[in-house]
Interface confidence: low
């Protein structure tokens, strides 16, 4: 209540919106053929939608999202020596959510 | 650089530090012996340490935990009516993180 | 200050209909969930109702399930109780409360009541 | 659902005197008990959350104490402004319960 403390706060719902997530640049982003190469940086955050919505039928999802090219390094090993060079990794943004009801197909008869 | 528009930023690293992240509380937490009812509200905000380190033999780690209560509603359904009581679950909170080295097994000679 | 602020009582027939409303001011209106409570004449209180901050969220007493809905407008800062089919026993002054949050179900801050008054 | 008791319903007492009002459940409800003041023709107004918890702006002198099932309201001091009615309310399940009321008088 307005103005109270009690030891245990009660538990406020986790709205759905938009939050910063950890998102692992791994290596086929940047090349499916060659595994003898290395990716900085390893990591980089994002904007993703997540959170809970009012009952179990709706689901928190991203109502506008904006793709975001970034310039990693792609360190590749030649000869016991690293090469630099760059590479793009285009990363997803959700830049709005909603509480969205979860379409489950109907049976066919 | 200043003054040019590049199409790609470069890539920053997801540094190592608490971010907020969502948890699913599951009804376990509350009642182990009966499934026939549902927790209020269904998920909430914790910190949470994440991120990358300079190199792949170290992981971003809590090097200091909070533990934190908060009053939960146990939504009870008795003959198709639902009875509201309070519960505690106890959160865990990341207050600091650190760049660990992974600690692997010697194999066994 | 917190200001609750009820309207909309008044005399009504047996089976009729009337809308509570409740104004609220000094407080984050959205965050809190709220309640309507109900006292008849020259007898203690009795709960009615109780809606989530979001509106989600609603709860009743079973002497009034079904014909009382309770309702909030956050843009207005406005709460509402819409009752139909009243009977006499719903005589009473209806008062708003601020019930806290998620797990607090009681009622911290009220108005000052409205009187409702069901009679042929 | 759970039925709130109050004792006495109704007692005298001077100024100055230590008031103790008592409300019990029906079934063990915690300590998620709350008490409230009602004036004459006025709105009740929240003085003990939590069985023991004191409202803000609430005087010291209003104490609550008990848990599980026997709870008490203890005013340490009567003042001439405490004369009033006193509910107790569970907040453990709905629906949502009072006592019926201790009224307070002046002796």
């Known amino acids: 209540s307005l103005g109270s403390l009690a030891a245990a706060e009660p538990a406020v719902i986790a709205e759905c919106k938009t939050r910063t997530e950890v998102f692992q640049i791994s290596r086929n982003l940047i090349d499916r053929t060659n595994a003898n190469f290395l990716v900085w940086p390893p990591c980089v955050e994002v904007q993703r939608c997540s959170g809970c919505c009012n009952n179990r039928n709706v689901q928190c999802r991203a109502s506008q999202v904006q793709m975001r090219p970034v310039q990693v390094r792609k360190i590749e090993i030649v000869r016991k020596k690293p090469i630099f060079k760059k590479a793009t990794v285009t990363l997803e943004d959700h830049l709005a959510c909603k509480c969205e009801t979860i379409v489950t197909p109907r049976p066919v008869t | 650089s200043l003054g040019s528009l590049a199409a790609a930023e470069p890539a920053v690293i997801a540094e190592c530090k608490t971010r907020t992240e969502v948890f699913q509380i599951s009804r376990n937490l509350i009642d182990r012996t009966n499934a026939n009812f549902l927790v209020w509200p269904p998920c909430v905000e914790v910190q949470r340490c994440s991120g990358c380190c300079n190199n792949r033999n170290v992981q971003c780690r809590a090097s200091q935990v909070q533990m934190r209560p908060v009053q939960v509603r146990k939504i009870e359904i008795v003959r198709k009516k639902p009875i509201f009581k309070k519960a505690t679950v106890t959160l865990e909170d990341h207050l600091a993180c650190k760049c660990e080295t992974i600690v692997t097994p010697r194999p066994v000679t | 200050e917190v200001q609750l602020v009820e309207s909309g009582g008044g005399l009504v027939q047996p089976g009729g209909s009337l809308r509570l409303s409740c104004a609220a001011s000094g407080f984050t209106f959205s965050s809190y969930w709220m309640s309507w409570v109900r006292q008849a004449p020259e007898k203690g209180l009795e709960w009615v109702s109780t809606i989530s901050d979001g509106g989600g969220l609603t709860y009743y007493a079973d002497s009034v399930k079904g014909r009382f809905t309770i309702s909030r407008d956050n843009a207005k800062n406005s709460l509402y109780l819409q009752m139909n089919s009243l009977r006499a026993e719903d005589t009473a002054v209806y008062y708003c409360?601020?019930?806290?949050?998620?797990?607090?179900?009681?009622?911290?801050?009220w108005g000052q009541g409205t009187l409702v008054t069901v009679s042929s | 659902d759970i039925q709130m008791t109050q004792s006495p319903s109704s007692l005298s007492a001077s100024v100055g005197d230590r008031v103790a009002i008592t409300c019990r459940a029906s079934q063990s409800i915690s300590n998620y008990l709350n008490w409230y003041q009602q004036k004459p023709g006025k709105a009740p107004k929240l003085l003990i959350y939590?069985?023991?918890s004191l409202q803000s702006g609430v005087p010291s002198r209003f104490s609550g104490s008990g848990s599980g099932t026997d709870f008490t309201l203890t005013i340490s001091s009567l003042q001439p402004e405490d004369f009033a009615t006193y509910y107790c309310q569970q907040s453990y399940s709905t629906p949502l319960t009072f006592g019926g009321g201790t009224k307070v008088e002046i002796k």
């Open positions: 939590a069985a023991s």
């Open positions: 409360a601020e019930s806290g949050g998620y797990t607090d179900w009681l009622f911290g801050y």
